[in-house]
């Protein structure tokens, strides 16, 4: 999948964790569809 950034968006991220994607793991799965 693709995500485009660089436009205004609302974020509900915690102030204690970065909102960037965490490091990949082999447990990561792609959503169907």
């Amino acid at each position: 999948s693709e995500t485009t950034t660089g436009t205004s968006s609302n974020s509900s991220q915690s102030t204690s964790n970065s909102g960037l994607a965490p490091n990949p793991t082999n447990a990561t799965t792609k959503a169907a569809g």
Partner: antibody
Amino acid sequence: QVQLVQSGAEVKKPGASVKVSCKASGYDFTGYHMGWVRQAPGQGLEWMGEINPITSDKTFNQKFKSRVTMTRDTSISTAYMELSRLRSDDTAVYYCARRDYGTSLDYWGQGTTVTVSS
Amino acid sequence: DIQLTQSPSFLSASVGDRVTITCRASKSISKYLAWYQQKPGKAPKLLIYAGSTLHSGIPSRFRGSGSGTEFTLTISSLQPEDFATYYCQQHNEYPIIFGQGTKLEIK
């Protein structure tokens, strides 16, 4: 030790495409996102986007979304960035950089100079 | 998008000096700010991440501090190899953004 080795300099004409490679060694290639950053002559750093090597999910800077293609080949621990419809203002050094969740862009390739000139 | 503003853009100093560079974010980025050093013709090198954590192999004369919207990079005693351009970069959210850079020159 972590190493990112990029392909050599390129000279392209306006309207053409360029594909830059970035071969990783010294770590598990699939364990970190690979980002791409460019730097025009005498200018600052501009993040273009990144790819998840396991899922191939990508996150782009809006500015480049329509022209950039990011791919990877996990069998040879290599990431690729292709930029199409080149313009003279795409003349820059293009860097790949490993992104670790905790530390951000912690290791960088040596850079690939792309010159766009008619 | 978040904007990062570095000051000053240019800085002249002498070996042994203590220098401070500031990076201000247009909105809170918690602690997620990194600092990079770049020398001419070379790739940037990570110095500090998460506001204040020194990357491996970086000398202790480099110190980062701050959170929220205001951050500083301090070099306690400048060495000849420290003259370079320094960039801040937020790693709190997409898109990843860099400051415009601070060029540190020999006085």
